[in-house]
């Protein structure tokens, strides 16, 4: 805390300008009026204050707005935002996307800080849902943002927002998250034709059920192995050799390199060896010819 001392003669700030960077902390405290600071916040970010000086300016704003800053001030915080704690941010009511963008810009190129996470949380909760413009903005600044949300939080994403999602935004999503996002993507892209639809839906297929994969296999989509390897194992297991061959098209040859990895390994174990042999890839581990396969899960359901 800066000591309360009288402002030296001739040093009282009449406006927020560059001369203030040469003020000591105690001079800033004594010579800058909080109300003046609040009305001229737009100038602060253009002036290269030290972080110590920004501490003093923050203290002044805190005294002026103990219940939380108004958006007119928040919008112009600039580097002063880095001095805010999550507790400070929880007092704010940020409704403008422009304000959000301005504050995210300050942290650009860095990992998401607790301050930023709190700001985003406040903003999204205030809006009630993660709309397209917000998602567009957030994924532009933080490509991994979507995958940082819980499945519950993702359920508030409207299908229309899915258009803003880029493949790299889903890189770190786990199957539980893709389970939530896939049906939204399917709905969002439903009016697209076959090849265009596949390009858009491809990144979300880690959440696709068996019946959708079967449907895709009828459309000559030529799924690459990287996408296939991200599919849900339980969705891949019921696919026949013929369906997988159609699904992968020319990429089917890549199965050999992946035969020891899931879901390929588990899928092979479920196929008849003579069906696998038709691929001509030398895949081994299928059910030997003449063996009968009992689906015990089906038997339990009947009894």
């Amino acid at each position: 805390e800066v000591e309360k001392t009288a402002c030296p003669s001739g040093k009282k700030a009449r406006e927020i300008d560059e001369s203030l960077i040469f003020y000591k902390k105690w001079e800033l405290e004594a010579c800058v009026d909080a109300a003046l600071l609040a009305t001229q916040m737009d100038r602060v970010n253009a002036i290269p204050f030290t972080y110590e000086q920004l501490d003093v300016l923050k203290h002044k704003l805190d005294e002026l707005y103990p219940q939380g800053y108004p958006e007119s001030v928040i919008q112009h915080l600039g580097y002063l935002f880095l001095k805010m704690s999550p507790e400070d941010i929880r007092k704010w009511n940020v409704t403008s996307l422009e304000t959000l963008k301005a504050l995210l810009e300050v942290n650009k190129g860095h990992e998401m800080s607790p301050q930023v996470a709190t700001l985003i949380d406040r903003f999204v909760k205030g809006r009630g849902q993660l709309d397209k413009d917000t998602l567009d903005t957030l994924t532009a600044f933080y490509p991994g943002y979507l995958c940082s949300l819980s499945p519950e939080e993702l359920s508030s994403v409207p299908p229309s927002s899915i258009w803003a999602v880029r493949p790299q935004d889903l890189d770190t999503c786990d199957p539980r998250q893709l389970d939530v996002l896939y049906p939204k993507a399917r709905l969002a892209f439903q009016n697209m034709n076959g090849s265009e639809y596949f390009v858009k839906i491809q990144s979300f297929l880690g959440g696709a059920p068996t019946e959708d994969l079967k449907a895709l296999s009828q459309q000559n989509v030529s799924m690459d192995l990287a996408t296939f390897m991200k599919l849900r194992t339980d969705a891949v297991l019921p696919l026949t050799v013929a369906e997988v061959q159609k699904l992968l098209g020319p990429h089917v040859e890549g199965l050999k390199a992946e035969e020891r990895h899931r879901p390929v390994r588990d899928w092979i174990l479920r196929q008849r060896q003579d069906d696998l042999d038709t691929l001509g890839l030398g895949l081994q581990g299928g059910i030997p010819n003449g063996y009968l396969v009992l689906d015990l899960s089906m038997q339990e359901a009947l009894s």
């Epitope: 290269p48 030290t50 972080y51 920004l54 580097y79 880095l82 001095k83 300050v106 942290n107 650009k108 190129g109 860095h110 800080s113």
Partner: nanobody
Framework: QVQLVESGGGLVQAGGSLRLSCAAS????????MRWYRQAPGTERDLVAV??????YYADSVKGRFTISRDNAKNTLYLQMNNLKPEDTAVYYC???????????WGQGTQVTVSS
């Protein structure tokens, strides 16, 4: 992390010139603002000059005599000091702000002595 190392200090006669350098290494792409401070014996550290983007700022006591500049390609900050006075005698420190987290970095200082 950013490391700063000053050089170029020394003993000079009043009216003479010196050029201080501050070499930055580490995560230099994160540097937003750079500054020169000085501290004379028994006094507080004072801000001398600041460079932010293409804008420069000077303390009244050095205006017209000192020039701050930055070579981004070499990650080096300079302070050209002309018409030096005995009252410019001090340890000069280089300082840099990290752009995305609220912290700054300091060099170890370089001594400048101006004799009359």
């Amino acid at each position: 992390q950013v490391q700063l190392v000053e050089s170029g200090g020394g003993l000079v006669q009043a009216g003479g010139s010196l050029r201080l350098s501050c070499a930055a290494s580490g995560s230099t792409f994160r540097i937003r603002v750079m500054r020169w401070y000085r501290q004379a014996p028994g006094t507080e550290r004072d801000l001398v000059a600041v460079i932010s983007g293409s804008s420069t700022y000077y303390a009244d006591s050095v205006k017209g005599r000192f020039t701050i500049s930055r070579d981004n390609a070499k990650n080096t900050l300079y302070l050209q000091m002309n018409n030096l006075k005995p009252e410019d005698t001090a340890v000069y420190y280089c300082n840099a702000d990290d752009s995305g987290i609220a912290r700054d970095y300091w060099g170890q200082g370089t001594q400048v002595t101006v004799s009359s």
